[in-house]
Interface confidence: low
C-alpha cells in the first residue's frame, strides 16, 4: 500500500460554504431527449453540448437539436444553435473534435432525402464560429482527423468511396472507390482495404490492403487476400486467408507494410477472431479466440518485432467479435493490466498482471471485506472486478474501472469479494498502489471520477431515485464528506469532468421532471476553495512502485527497472494544480532470466526459467518466417522482453544457432506487391 497516515477522518473545514459559493446551475431551455458533451482542447474550459429531441410523427420522425457552448468548464452555457443555422445535427456521428489543441470541430448535419450530398459545420476557433459546407457525398462514418495534421480529414461515403480533404473539410476529393475500411497511420499515411467484386461482405478474405503516403496521389498494394487489418503502436497487422482453406493468420509489419512477417500465432477459422487488446511501441497483447462458441480465448504477448508470441493467459473472457472483454490497462501504474477469465465451472474471475502479461494472479482480498456466498472457504477469496462484460449483462454496475496516468497508483472499480464475480449489488473498491492491495471505498454502486491528479475523488450514488448529494474525498477515498448541491433532486444521468483528471471542476448532469415537461440541467462544482493552497515539497512523500519486499535490493523491479514517485500525502489537503507533472525517478535493475523470453524455436519447460531448443518444429511453427521469404533465422534462444531495461546481471548468451527452414507462406513475397499512381 502507498504510504499514508492512519488517522481519524478529519472534516474539511467550512466545505459547505466553500462549495455553495462555487456551485453553478444551468437549466437548458430544452425538452429532454439525448445529450452529448465534448471537451474542445485541453485546459481551454470549452465544452460543447448537443441536445437532440425526436418527435415521432405519423409517417416520419421530426428532429430538433440545440448546441450550447461553455468556456468556463461548464459553469455557464450559451445557446449557439444559430451559429449552425438551427440545423438538426446527426448524433450518431457525434462531434468530431480535432486532435491536441487544434480547436477544430466538425458537426455532421441531417439532410433531406433527395440531396446530392451531406452537410457539415466546421469550426477552427474552439466553436466560436462555424462555417457551413455542403459535401459532394453522403458520409457513412464520422470525419477522421490525421493525428499529424488536423487540416487533413478522411471519410467514407455511403457508396464506399474514400474521400479526403486537405483544407479542413472545405474541399473534398474522392481518392478511391470500393473501400471497406480506412485508417490514418503515422506521417499522414492512409491504409485502406478495397473489394474487387461484389461488396465488402462478399469479398471478406479476398480484400486488398492499400497504402497512400501522399493523400491519394499514388498508391501501393501492400497485401492481398485480406480479411481485416489493424494498427497498434508501431505495428501494422493484417489477418490473411490461407491458400488452401478457410483459415486465416496474422501477419505483421513494422515498416508501414513494405515487408511482412508471419506472426507465430495459431491460425483461426471462419467463426473465430483475433483482437488487439493493447499495443504500444514495444509490444502487443493479442487475443486469439478459441474454436467454437466458447466465449473465451488465449492472450498472447509479442516480442519487440511482433513476430514471436508467448502464451500469457488461458481462458480469457471475450464473448464474440466486437463483443465484450474486461481487458483493462491500468494507466496509473506501468505494466499493470486487469481482465477476466472464464473458469471451468463457467464462473468469471478477475486476474491481474503487474509485469505486462508475464504472470497473472488473482486480486488480493481487501482487508476490510468478508468473502461472499461465492466463496467455498470463507477465509480465502479474492476481489473480482466488474468491467465491460458486467455492464453489458445489465448488472448494477454504472461504471468501468477508472485509473489516470497522473493519479499515480490509484485504481477505482466496482467489485465483489469471493471466488468469482457475483451478480449481487457490488461495492466500490480502491487501490492506491496500482492493484496490489485494495480497500472497500464505498458501499453500493456509484459513479466516480478523479480530479486534480488524485487530490480529490468525487462520487455519486447510483440510484433510480432523484439525487441531490455528491460525495468527495481528499485522502484517496479513506474519508468522505457529503455535499447537498441542490434542494431539488434531479434524475442523474452522468458525471463529466475534463479528460486527464487535472481539473478541479465536476459537472453533474441530469434532468428535472415536472407534470408536463422534463428539462436538462447541469450543476458544475469547483473544488478550488476546498484545496485552498498549492502543494509544497512537504506535501509529497517518496513511494517505490511495485514494492513487495523492501528488504530485497531488487524490490520494485518490473521489466528491468524500478521507479520511485513523489506521491501526495493522504493527509495533505492542497492543490496539485493544472500544471502538475508526475515526478518519477527510474533506476535500472540487474538482469535475470525472467527479463528474457524464449525466441522462435525455443521453449521453457515447466518450472524452469531456461529456454530449451525445441527438438523439432511442427504445426504453425513450420510456417513461421521473416519477411515472407526463405530466411536464415539466427538466435541464441533468448530475446529481451519488450520494454525491459535491465542491465548487467544474467546475460544468457550462448552459441548462436541457424534455424534454417523453408517459409511456407508466400503471402506477401515482393513479386506480389505492386505500385501505381493516380
Amino acid at each position: 500500500s502507498a504510504p499514508g497516515e492512519d488517522e481519524e477522518c478529519g472534516r474539511v473545514r467550512d466545505f459547505v460554504a466553500k462549495l455553495a459559493n462555487n456551485t453553478h446551475q444551468h437549466v437548458f431551455d430544452d425538452l429532454r431527449g439525448s445529450v452529448s458533451l465534448s471537451w474542445v482542447g485541453d485546459s481551454t474550459g470549452v465544452i460543447l453540448v448537443l441536445t437532440t429531441f425526436h418527435v415521432p410523427l405519423v409517417i416520419m420522425t421530426f428532429g430538433q437539436s440545440k448546441l450550447y457552448r461553455s468556456e468556463d468548464y461548464g459553469k455557464n452555457f450559451k445557446d449557439i444553435t444559430d451559429l449552425i443555422n438551427n440545423t438538426f445535427i446527426r448524433t450518431e456521428f457525434g462531434m468530431a473534435i480535432g486532435p491536441e489543441n487544434s480547436g477544430k470541430v466538425v458537426l455532421t448535419a441531417e439532410v433531406s432525402g433527395g440531396s446530392r450530398g451531406g452537410r457539415i459545420f466546421r469550426s477552427s476557433d474552439f466553436a466560436k464560429n462555424f462555417v457551413q459546407t455542403d459535401l459532394p457525398f453522403h458520409p457513412l462514418t464520422q470525419m477522421m482527423y490525421s493525428p499529424q495534421n488536423s487540416d487533413y480529414l478522411l471519410a467514407l461515403s455511403t457508396e464506399n468511396g474514400l474521400w479526403v480533404s486537405k483544407n479542413f473539410g472545405g474541399k473534398w476529393e474522392e481518392i478511391h472507390k470500393a473501400v471497406c475500411l480506412a485508417k490514418w497511420g503515422s506521417d499522414n499515411t492512409i491504409f485502406f482495404t478495397t473489394y474487387a467484386n461484389g461488396s465488402c461482405k462478399a469479398d471478406l478474405g479476398a480484400l486488398e490492403l492499400w497504402r497512400t503516403s501522399d493523400l491519394g496521389k499514388s498508391f501501393k498494394t501492400i497485401g492481398v487476400k485480406i480479411y481485416s487489418f489493424g494498427l497498434g503502436g508501431r505495428f501494422l497487422f493484417a489477418s490473411v486467408m490461407a491458400d488452401k482453406d478457410t483459415t486465416r493468420r496474422i501477419h505483421v509489419s513494422t515498416d508501414q507494410g513494405d515487408t511482412w512477417s508471419m506472426a507465430q500465432l495459431p491460425s483461426v477459422g471462419q467463426e473465430q477472431f483475433y483482437s488487439i487488446l493493447a499495443a504500444n511501441d514495444d509490444m502487443v497483447f493479442m487475443h486469439v479466440d478459441e474454436p467454437g462458441d466458447t466465449g473465451f480465448g488465449t492472450i498472447f504477448t509479442s516480442d519487440d518485432r511482433g513476430i514471436v508470441y508467448s502464451k500469457s493467459l488461458d481462458r480469457h473472457l471475450y464473448t464474440t467479435t466486437g463483443g465484450e472483454t474486461d481487458f483493462t490497462n491500468v494507466t496509473s501504474l506501468r505494466g499493470v493490466y486487469i481482465t477476466s477469465v472464464l473458469s471451468e465451472d463457467n464462473s468469471i474471475q478477475t486476474m491481474i498482471t503487474f509485469d505486462q502479461g508475464g504472470r497473472w494472479t488473482h486480486l488480493r482480498k481487501p482487508e476490510n471485506s468478508e468473502c461472499d456466498a461465492t466463496a467455498k472457504n470463507k477465509n480465502e477469496c479474492s476481489l473480482h472486478i466488474h468491467a465491460s462484460y458486467s455492464i453489458s449483462q445489465k448488472l448494477n454496475v454504472p461504471m468501468a474501472p477508472l485509473s489516470e496516468p497522473n493519479a499515480v497508483g490509484i485504481v477505482i472499480a466496482h467489485g465483489s469479494v469471493g471466488d468469482a464475480i457475483s451478480v449481487m449489488v457490488p461495492d466500490v473498491y480502491i487501490s492506491d498502489d496500482g492493484g496490489y492491495s485494495w480497500t472497500k471505498m464505498l458501499e453500493g454502486p456509484h459513479y466516480y471520477t478523479i480530479l486534480d491528479s488524485g487530490g480529490i475523488i468525487v462520487a455519486i450514488e447510483h440510484s433510480s431515485r432523484p439525487i441531490n448529494v455528491i460525495k468527495f474525498s481528499t485522502d484517496e477515498g479513506q474519508c468522505w464528506q457529503t455535499y447537498t448541491f441542490t434542494r431539488d433532486p434531479i434524475y442523474f444521468t452522468g458525471l463529466a469532468s475534463e479528460p486527464g483528471a487535472r481539473s478541479m471542476n465536476i459537472s453533474i448532469w441530469g434532468f428535472t421532471e415536472s407534470f408536463l415537461t422534463s428539462q436538462w440541467v447541469s450543476y458544475t462544482i469547483d473544488f478550488k476553495d476546498i484545496l485552498e493552497r498549492n502543494c509544497e515539497e512537504k506535501d509529497y512523500t517518496i513511494w517505490l512502485a511495485h514494492s513487495t519486499d523492501p528488504e530485497d535490493y531488487e524490490d520494485g523491479c518490473i521489466l528491468g527497472y524500478k521507479e520511485q514517485f513523489l506521491r501526495l500525502r493522504k493527509s495533505s489537503v492542497c492543490q496539485n494544480g493544472r500544471d502538475y507533472v508526475v515526478t518519477k525517478q527510474p533506476s535500472i535493475c540487474l538482469c535475470s532470466l525472467e527479463d528474457f523470453l524464449c525466441d522462435f524455436g525455443y521453449y521453457r519447460p515447466e518450472n524452469d526459467s531456461k529456454c530449451v531448443e525445441q527438438p523439432e518444429l511442427k504445426g504453425h511453427d513450420l510456417e513461421f518466417c521473416l519477411y515472407g521469404r526463405e530466411e536464415h533465422l539466427t538466435t541464441n534462444g533468448y530475446r529481451k522482453i519488450p520494454g525491459d531495461k535491465c542491465q548487467g546481471g544474467v546475460n544468457p548468451v550462448r552459441e548462436v544457432k541457424d534455424l534454417k527452414k523453408k517459409c511456407t507462406s508466400n503471402f506477401l513475397s515482393p513479386e506480389k506487391q505492386n505500385s501505381k499512381s493516380n
Epitope: 515539497e537 512537504k538 512523500t541 517518496i542 535490493y553 520511485q564 514517485f565 513523489l566 515526478t583 518519477k584 525517478q585 527510474p586 533506476s587 535500472i588 542491465q647
Partner: antibody
Framework: EVQLVESGGDLVKPGGSLKLSCAAS????????MSWVRQTPDKRLEWVAI????????HYPDSVKGRFTISRDNAKNTLYLQMSSLKSEDTAMYYC???????????WGQGTSVTVSS | QAVVTQESALTTSPGETVTLTCRSS?????????ANWVQEKPDHLFTGLIG???NRAPGVPARFSGSLIGDKAALTITGAQTEDEAIYFC??????????FGGGTKLTVL
C-alpha cells in the same frame, strides 16, 4: 527555506568522544534519509554515516564502523552523530547533509569543526 | 571500494558552456547511481545543486543541469557566470558501499 544547522564540534583528545547534532527545518525531515559527510584537511569529502527516514536502517563506511553511531529524533527534527574512540584522522569539518537518492535535491549544513589532537 | 574520478580543474569564460564529468571505476554511471552534485565556495559553504542525476534543487539557477553523458555523470553550466567559480564535487551511490565522493573539480571563470 530548508536549513540544516550543525553543532557540537570541538577539540578532543585521541580516544575521546563527541556528539554532533543537526537541527533541520523547512522540509519534512521524517520523509528523508540523512547523512553525515566530512571534509578532511586535504579537502577530500568522505561520507560517514547514513540513516533511513524512520531510523530503522543505518550504514557506515569501514573507516568509522563500530566507533560512530548515527541516530535521529523525528519529533525534534534532529539528526545526531555519536563519535567515540576518536583518532587523529577523524579531524575534519562535519556536515549534516540530505544526499539524495532518486527524487530529491541535496541540502547541506554549514558544518561543525572536529579536531582530534593530543 | 569504488573510486570516483573528476577533472581536477577546468577554466571557462563568462557566458560559455562548461561540462564537468564524474567517472566511476566500476563501469558506466547509470541513473541507479543517483549522481549528486555539490558546490563548495570559500568558508566551507556547501550548496546541493543536483540530486538523483538530474533533479535541480529549489533556488538553483536553471543554467545548472545534470545528466548522463556516455558512461559518466555530467554537470553542465550553460552560460557560466563569475559567481560560479567554485569547487564542484560529485557523489555516486553504490548499493554495496553507499556514497562515494569524487575529488572535486576546481572551476575558474575568467
Amino acid at each position: 527555506e530548508v536549513q540544516l544547522v550543525e553543532s557540537g564540534g570541538d577539540l578532543v583528545k585521541p580516544g575521546g568522544s563527541l556528539k554532533l547534532s543537526c537541527a533541520a527545518s523547512g522540509f519534512t525531515f521524517s520523509s528523508y534519509g540523512m547523512s553525515w559527510v566530512r571534509q578532511t584537511p586535504d579537502k577530500r569529502l568522505e561520507w560517514v554515516a547514513i540513516i533511513s527516514s524512520g531510523g530503522s536502517y543505518t550504514h557506515y563506511p569501514d573507516s568509522v564502523k563500530g566507533r560512530f553511531t548515527i541516530s535521529r529524533d523525528n519529533a525534534k527534527n534532529t539528526l545526531y552523530l555519536q563519535m567515540s574512540s576518536l583518532k587523529s584522522e577523524d579531524t575534519a569539518m562535519y556536515y549534516c547533509a540530505r544526499l539524495c537518492g532518486p527524487l530529491c535535491s541535496g541540502y547541506w549544513g554549514q558544518g561543525t569543526s572536529v579536531t582530534v589532537s593530543s | 571500494q569504488a573510486v570516483v574520478t573528476q577533472e581536477s580543474a577546468l577554466t571557462t569564460s563568462p557566458g560559455e558552456t562548461v561540462t564537468l564529468t564524474c567517472r566511476s571505476s566500476t563501469g558506466a554511471v547509470t541513473t541507479s547511481n543517483y549522481a549528486n552534485w555539490v558546490q563548495e565556495k570559500p568558508d566551507h559553504l556547501f550548496t546541493g545543486l543536483i540530486g538523483g542525476t538530474n533533479n535541480r534543487a529549489p533556488g538553483v539557477p536553471a543554467r545548472f543541469s545534470g545528466s548522463l553523458i556516455g558512461d559518466k555523470a555530467a554537470l553542465t553550466i550553460t552560460g557560466a557566470q563569475t559567481e560560479d567559480e567554485a569547487i564542484y564535487f560529485c557523489a555516486l551511490w553504490y548499493s554495496n558501499h553507499f556514497w562515494v565522493f569524487g575529488g572535486g573539480t576546481k572551476l575558474t571563470v575568467l
